[in-house]
């Protein structure tokens, strides 16, 4: 089952999946000036069986101006820009993804892909949070979020992480011991948290999702 929304956003933090559950989709997005090839895949899909998982489909980008040039090679280092949800720098090596049954490792880059990878996760996916450079983590509990199915609806658990503006970076799980606290907020049992682009967390939008998530008007 696909999760109905993206993981919650925490101010001054980014998240990363160490491995991707089967069923995860990675959009075939191209950087500005390029587009998916005609008849190309819309997304890559993590598929497989209990012993081996891999990404189905290939993403290919072509110049918006040139019709018949398609490339699919590894970008040069200067093209390897930060991707918000996938390639955050950390001195720690991720867990051995190959050892996780039913999971895919990070797909290799394709030429002229967008600078940010957009994943659509499935129930059971876990993502880990860390504070961005220049912020320090204050843990109330696990700095992770899991997509869960409750009463037929999907929701992400709330990571117990606060990032404060002290010049010290925190790392992915394993780098520092989370400080479990009895005062930590209990995760919501009602709905997924909803996020906006300015990182303000909103918690009252579940009813909106039930009916219509768009309003349309004309001028």
């Amino acid at each position: 089952e696909l999760c109905d929304d993206d993981p919650p956003e925490i101010p001054h933090a980014t998240f990363k999946a160490m491995a991707y559950k089967e069923g995860t989709m990675l959009n075939c997005e191209c950087k500005r000036g390029f587009r998916r090839i005609k008849s190309g895949s819309l997304y890559m899909l993590c598929t497989g069986n209990s012993s081996h998982s891999s990404w189905d489909n290939q993403c290919q980008c072509t110049s918006s101006a040139t019709r018949n040039t398609t490339k699919q090679v590894t970008p040069q280092p200067e093209e390897q820009k930060e991707r918000k949800t996938t390639e955050m720098q950390s001195p720690m090596q991720p867990v051995d993804q190959a050892s996780l049954p039913g999971h895919c490792r990070e797909p290799p880059p394709w030429e002229n892909e967008a600078t940010e990878r957009i994943y659509h996760f499935v129930v059971g996916q876990m993502v880990y949070y860390q504070c961005v450079q220049g912020y320090r983590a204050l843990h109330r509990g696990p700095a992770e979020s899991v997509c869960k199915m409750t009463h037929g609806k999907t929701r992400w658990t709330q990571p117990q992480l606060i990032c404060t503006g002290e010049m010290e970076t925190s790392q992915f799980p394993g780098e520092e011991k989370p400080q479990a606290s009895p005062e930590g907020r209990p995760e919501s049992e009602t709905s997924c948290l909803v996020t906006t682009t300015d990182f303000q967390i909103q918690t009252e939008m579940a009813a909106t999702m039930e009916t219509s998530i768009f309003t349309t008007e004309y001028q």
Epitope: D5, M25, C30, R35, K38
Partner: antibody, heavy 104, light 110 residues
Framework: PGGSLRLSCAAS????????MNWVRQAPGKGLEWVSY????????YYADSVKGRFTISRDNAKNSLYLQMNSLRAEDTAVYYC??????????WGQGTLVTVSS | QSALTQPASVSGSPGQSITISCTGT?????????VSWYQQHPGKAPKLMIY???NRPSGVSNRFSGSKSGNTASLTISGLQAEDEADYYC??????????FGTGTKVTVL
């Protein structure tokens, strides 16, 4: 006929900038017709032949908004216009729609 | 781009199973596994029932299933219920990087 309109679609409840968006319309008593597509960043755009050169799709991710600028309107553009979010190969969430009537 | 072909109407009694077909070409239905199905009640926005040929979104009853063979996709509704009475549309991604919808099928529960 010949006039212009701009449709707006305000999205909430999901991370708008992570999704490709579309406009779909439905003339009164008729079926659904796909109108236009825009990628999550706004860098890639496609139109149905019936609106190409007249309609312009755009988005403002900072405002969680999708737009459709409609110029040189014709009577056959009369329809309910829906904005729709794409995930996978389908449109998984739809707006409630707005009726556009083109008449003299 | 021509609309995908669907039967204008399909009917069945409560508890029965019905199948709606959606026929396209190798440039749309036959060329991709990006076929989706939508339910639309009068005056309402469409609702996604099946995506990528056979996948059900969360919250959609498992009475709805999808399949594809060649250039034809199918939606099957088993254990037909009164609330299933609605219009149903198929859709497919195309080789032009656009989308095309079906002509629509009115489902009547007798």
């Amino acid at each position: 006929p010949g006039g212009s309109l701009r449709l707006s679609c305000a999205a909430s409840g999901f991370t708008f900038s992570s999704y490709e968006m579309n406009w779909v319309r439905q003339a009164p008593g008729k079926g659904l017709e796909w109108v236009s597509y825009i990628s999550s960043s706004g860098s890639t755009i496609y139109y149905a032949d019936s609106v190409k050169g007249r309609f312009t799709i755009s988005r403002d991710n900072a405002k969680n908004s999708l737009y459709l600028q409609m110029n040189s309107l014709r009577a056959e553009d009369t329809a309910v216009y829906y904005c729709a979010r794409r995930r996978g190969g389908g449109f998984d969430y739809w707006g409630q729609g707005t009726l556009v009537t083109v008449s003299s | 781009q021509s609309a995908l072909t669907q039967p204008a109407s399909v009917s069945g009694s409560p508890g029965q199973s019905i199948t709606i077909s959606c026929t396209g070409t190798s440039s749309d239905v036959g060329g991709y596994n990006y076929v989706s199905w939508y339910q639309q009640h009068p005056g309402k926005a469409p609702k996604l029932m099946i995506y990528d040929v056979s996948n059900r979104p969360s919250g959609v009853s498992n009475r709805f299933s999808g399949s594809k063979s060649g250039n034809t996709a199918s939606l099957t509704i088993s254990g037909l219920q009164a609330e299933d009475e609605a219009d149903y549309y198929c859709s497919s991604y195309t080789s032009s990087s656009t989308y095309v919808f079906g002509t629509g099928t009115k489902v009547t529960v007798l």
